[in-house]
Every structure is written in C-alpha cells, then in structure tokens.
C-alpha cells in the first residue's frame, strides 16, 4: 500500500523519492506522474528527468533537492484539495523490467488559520504550520514553534533551511530510496 504524506491547502507539498547513482553524475531517468504507477512509464506525467537534466516539468511541480545526487523528491507548490491523490515516482533503471516504482499518497486538508497575535512571533502563522516528517503509518507531523521576529525573506530562507536540515534526514529514512550499482 502507498505511504501517506500530508499537507494543508496553500502549503508546498513534499513527496520524497531517492536513489543512489552508481557514480557521481551517472544519472538515471526519472518520471513523476499523477496516478498509481502503470506497467511502463508514468501516467499523467508532471515532471521528468533524463541522464543530465530535468527535461520536462509542469507548472507548480519541481525538484528542490539535488537530483544529480539522486534526490528526486517532488515539491508541489501552493496545493489545493484537488492535488490529493496517488503520485508515482519511477526510477527508470536500464534493462528490461528493472524500473523501481513508488506510489505515494498525498492527502491535502483544509488550512487551519490561527488568529495572528499583535506582534508576529509565531513562525507557523506566517508559513505552513505542519510539515510531514514520517511516511509510515498515520502521517506524523512536525509543528514548528515560536521563533524570533523575522521578515518574509528570512521566513522563506528559514523554511528552506528547516526543511533541508531537519526534515531531509527523516524523509530520506522514511521515503522511497534505492541504491543503484
């Protein structure tokens, strides 16, 4: 069954998928599609990489990690309820029927807006409140607590750092990961 990931409306959703290249720069084509992985390829392709680069993507779908090191995790920007569904990450390993397929279930819930305090001290009111950190069983969420006063540019930077530092290891542990070679 699919591993479940969650986000709230208006957030960026993150669907982890990883592989380990046989050698640095020795990349494998990857496709992401909406819908469960079919026998071949991806249905309703939203993003695709080849041996060198991202060669196809659609609005709001991008790879935020270092795909040259095998981090092909998908970010979906500014999600709505209609982004809920099964997503397929397919690592297209050369050879007959060698592909690795991962079905990831994304569930979007309505955003919960908390009344803003007089002075904006709560990071979570200015940026998505919950970030999924584990994929097994019921989606565990990590709520980000109070931080010092920061402006919007800092929020964006801080969000990236938080995701990269605090979540990447957790997600790598719990997400779709394979080693090649």
């Amino acid at each position: 069954s699919e591993v479940e990931y969650r986000a709230e409306v208006g957030q960026n959703a993150y669907l982890p998928c990883f592989y380990t290249p046989a050698a640095p720069g020795n990349l494998v084509p990857v496709c992401w599609g909406k819908g469960a992985c079919p026998v071949f390829e991806c249905g309703n392709v939203v993003l695709r990489t080849d041996e060198r680069d991202v060669n196809y993507w659609t609005s709001r779908y991008w790879l935020n990690g270092d795909f040259r090191k095998g981090d092909v995790s998908l970010t979906i920007e500014n999600v709505t309820l209609a982004d809920s569904g099964i997503y397929c990450c397919r690592i297209q390993i050369p050879g007959i029927m060698n592909d690795e397929k991962f079905n990831l279930k994304l569930v979007i819930k309505p955003a919960k807006v908390t009344p803003a305090p007089t002075r904006q001290r709560d990071f979570t009111a200015a940026f998505p409140r919950m970030l999924t950190t584990r994929g097994h069983g019921p989606a565990e969420t990590q709520t980000l607590g109070s931080l010092p006063d920061i402006n919007l540019t800092q929020i964006s930077t801080l969000a990236n750092e938080l995701r990269d530092s605090r979540l990447a290891n957790d997600l790598r542990d719990s997400g779709a990961t394979i080693r090649i070679g």
Epitope: T80, L81, A82, S84, V107, K109, P110
Partner: antibody, heavy 119, light 107 residues
Framework: QGQLQQPGAEVVKPGAAVKLSCKAS????????MQWIKQRPGQGLEWIGE????????DYNQHFKGKATLTVDTSSSTAYLQLSSLTSEDSAVYYC????????????WGPGTLVTVSS | DILMTQSPSSMSVSLGDTVSIICHAS??????IGWLQQKPGKSFKGLIY???NLEDGVPSRFSGSGSGADYSLTISSLESEDFADYYC?????????FGGGTKLEIK
C-alpha cells in the same frame, strides 16, 4: 465508506434554537472533515461550514456566523449543527456530508433533517 | 464569493442518450470541483471529485472534465436511474459555493 444518520424532521418555534445531529458510523470519525449544507426549495444549496472532528477546528460561511455553531462529540461519533434565533428563513433541509479518502469534501451525505420554523 | 453558473437548468432526454452539463466558475478553480446527484425527495450522492475522479461505486458512464473556470459532467447511455437533479460545487475557496442545479427529465 460508513453511514451518516440524521433525524427526519424538527419543528421549532420562531426565536428558539435547535441542535441538529449527524451520527457517523462505519469509519474513523476523527479522520474526516464534516460539512453542513442548507437546502431551501427554489433557493438552491448553501454551504454553512465545516468542522474537523479531530480538534474541533471550524470554518464558517460568513452568512451563517452568529446563526450556526458546529460542534462534535467524538465519544458518540456525532456532529452537531446548532441554529439560533430561528425565523421562517431558516426553514429548510439541513444535510451533513463528510469528505472522502482523497479530500473530496462532499463524498458521502446524510439523509438530511427538515427543519420547520412555525408558531 | 465564487459564482458557479450551471447550465442548462433543465433538459429532457431519452434513455440511451449522452448528455453534458456545464458549470462555469467566476474564476479559475483549479479542478476543485465536485458533481452531485439528488434524486427526487432524496439526499445527495457524490459522483465526481477534483474535476475528473469518480467517487466510489459510481458507474463509469459518468465522467467529468474541464480546467480553469469551465467544467462539465457527462453521462453516457442514460439509464432510468439517472433522471435526477445534478449540482456542481467548488471548493477552492471559502465559502464553498454550488451551481443552481440541472434537472434531468425523461422525454
């Protein structure tokens, strides 16, 4: 998929309040948001609001703020819609509906409760 | 509020026909649309969600399509149980808003 049960009808006097119930069974009550909808003949459908039974978080249609209050009782897997200061304009069928597995907000509906405001 | 304009308001059709009902939103709703069926004197049943997906147990003769602000529900090879009222609903924005409904009648 589960079931939603609602009483068939309620008759209430103008100015009074009424609390409508929607009893859920056959699914995990706290996992799915509940919607409430009003239907008046010739007036179409109006969305009243929604509630997350896991933490009682609510979103309301501004038109129903002060008129409608959404609550849940997780111990009995029941959602409630309370309507206050009733007038003839509140005479309608009120439905609860719950979301489906992929965040479809109006997947499964209760049978509705006909509220008649009459002296 | 997002206005959902549904057309036609009623149509007379025959068994076996294929019909389409249209909903136009007053802005882009990014496939955040559902289609509902209400039989006379009964409650509602969800048919389609997120523009194109069938709810559980809904026959494959029902289908949804569209993008942006324009969406449609198509029923192919109409059966007697399909004569009912149909509504669209958007849920991209609060408040959720419904179309005015389409009554499907037997010719």
């Amino acid at each position: 998929q589960g079931q939603l049960q609602q009483p068939g009808a309620e008759v209430v006097k103008p100015g009074a309040a009424v609390k409508l119930s929607c009893k859920a069974s056959g699914y995990t009550f706290t996992s799915y948001w509940m919607q409430w909808i009003k239907q008046r003949p010739g007036q179409g459908l109006e969305w009243i609001g929604e509630i997350d039974p896991s933490d009682n978080y609510t979103d309301y249609n501004q038109h129903f703020k002060g008129k409608a209050t959404l609550t849940v009782d997780t111990s009995s897997s029941t959602a409630y819609l309370q309507l206050s200061s009733l007038t003839s304009e509140d005479s309608a069928v009120y439905y609860c509906a719950r979301e489906g597995a992929f965040s479809s907000p109006f997947a499964y509906w209760g049978p509705g409760t006909l509220v008649t405001v009459s002296s | 509020d997002i206005l959902m304009t549904q057309s036609p308001s009623s149509m007379s059709v025959s068994l076996g026909d294929t019909v389409s009902i249209i909903c136009h939103a007053s802005q882009d709703i990014r496939s955040n649309i559902g289609w509902l069926q209400q039989k006379p004197g009964k409650s509602f049943k969800g048919l389609i969600y997120h523009g194109t997906n069938l709810e559980d147990g809904v026959p494959s003769r029902f289908s949804g399509s569209g993008s942006g602000a324009d969406y449609s529900l198509t029923i192919s090879s109409l059966e007697s149980e399909d004569f009912a009222d149909y509504y669209c609903v958007q849920y991209v924005q609060f408040p959720r808003t419904f179309g005015g409904g389409t009554k499907l009648e037997i010719k």
